[in-house]
Amino acid sequence: SGTTNTVAAYNLTWKSTNFKTILEWEPKPVNQVYTVQISTKSGDWKSKCFYTTDTECDLTDEIVKDVKQTYLARVFSYPAGNVESTGSAGEPLYENSPEFTPYLETNLGQPTIQSFEQVGTKVNVTVEDERTLVRRNNTFLSLRDVFGKDLIYTLYYWKSSSSGKKTAKTNTNEFLIDVDKGENYCFSVQAVIPSRTVNRKSTDSPVECMGQEKGEFREI
């Protein structure tokens, strides 16, 4: 159905990392434009990205209002220059997105090791608490604020002279690990949400090694 010179959007895909959320679709428009609508299951439709020739729409501002809600979006197709035109059923062509629940599905962004400090045979490794675009009382929440204890970090650490990676886990943003005296270690962290069934892990942080600038060494 629809007018002969418009085609419905397809391959609607949510791309979301740390709640920055963009809906993407195909095809690249030829003589047509798109408008996106988003709603929760029980809510009203809200229009975004009016009459755009883009094939993506940033819906972050909408989904961060309640990241635990489930959202549905739809993409309307209109003939370029004649956006009042509708399909044969009196409605513009549109396609629905898959449902999207940000809290359960947003990808975990690559974490960053903020610092590490060695005191004797103990090393304290601190993970940067990344800011998200989720707001509460006009302040942006960190990843830890949003996920609480649902978010854990896995630390991979290894002697610079070895390849075997030991692991440690924390549900804060700090690790305290035992190391061998006189050995240099390298570190990488991974964010994990064990309660999820999909998108459980982040990519690893950049590797940081002792003897580099981020660390501090104190001999006791």
Epitope: G164, K169, N171, Q190, R200, K201, T203
Partner: antibody, heavy 121, light 107 residues
């Protein structure tokens, strides 16, 4: 349904090699950690090593370090245990198991049926 | 490496008995201890994780507790299907380590 199926066990001479496979179904291995555990005849459980299939991180027990290699092919949803320079004391049933977390505590919630490796001349 | 010392290595009990198996960690492992049951010729099965949490589908007669570095698996009323070998495992540090096992036999 979550399932792990090991294969590749058998009889091998000392100094020989064998590759065990652990085919997973019902979940995606890249979201978890895969461990290998072995049990010599009439003995207890001995941890062999792990892999994080998402990033390839591995660690091995001292008893197998330098001889065994764990790898994973996420496209096949399968983990592997490559065993080289095998010794008589490596004779055991080898299990792969999925590790998950509750909070920060890890546990092995699903195990394969095991595959027997016998090292003998 | 952390040692997990399990005791007793074997015990004989009757159906209906209360059975207690202990594991002592050589250093602090927080709550990162799991208990497994293994029957002859079969793979181990998870019973308890995080020291005291009952795994899904495991009968409520099984329970776990922690006191410092001592961990206990209790079977409140032993059933015929519970005759097996039980292992503790710490996952607090790498490498994870198992206890030596406790074989529960019929008296």
């Amino acid at each position: 349904e979550v399932q792990l199926v090991e294969s590749g066990g058998g009889l091998v001479q000392p100094g020989g090699s064998l590759r065990l496979s652990c085919a997973a179904s019902g979940f995606t291995i890249s979201g978890y950690w895969i461990h290998w555990v072995r049990q010599a005849p009439g003995k207890g459980l001995e941890w062999v090593g792990y892999i994080d299939p998402y990033n390839g991180a591995t660690y091995y027990a001292d008893s197998v370090k330098g001889r065994f290699t764990i790898s994973a092919d996420t496209s096949k949803n399968t983990a592997y245990l490559q065993m080289n320079s095998l010794r008589a004391e490596d004779t055991a049933v080898y299990y792969c198991a999925r590790a998950d977390y509750y909070g920060v505590d890890e546990f092995l919630d699903y195990w394969g049926q095991g595959t027997l490796v016998t090292v003998s001349s | 490496d952390i040692q997990m010392t399990q005791s007793p290595s074997s015990l004989s009990a009757s159906v209906g008995d209360r059975v207690t198996i202990t594991c002592r960690a050589s250093q602090d492992v927080n709550t990162a201890v799991a208990w497994y049951q293994q029957k002859p010729g079969k793979a181990p099965k998870l019973l308890i994780y995080s020291a005291s949490f009952l795994y899904s589908g495991v009968p409520s007669r099984f329970s776990g507790s922690r006191s410092g570095t001592d961990f206990t698996l209790t079977i409140s009323s032993l059933q015929p299907e519970d005759f097996a070998t039980y292992y503790c495992q710490q996952h607090y540090t790498t490498p994870p380590t198992f206890g030596q096992g406790t074989k529960v036999e019929i008296k």
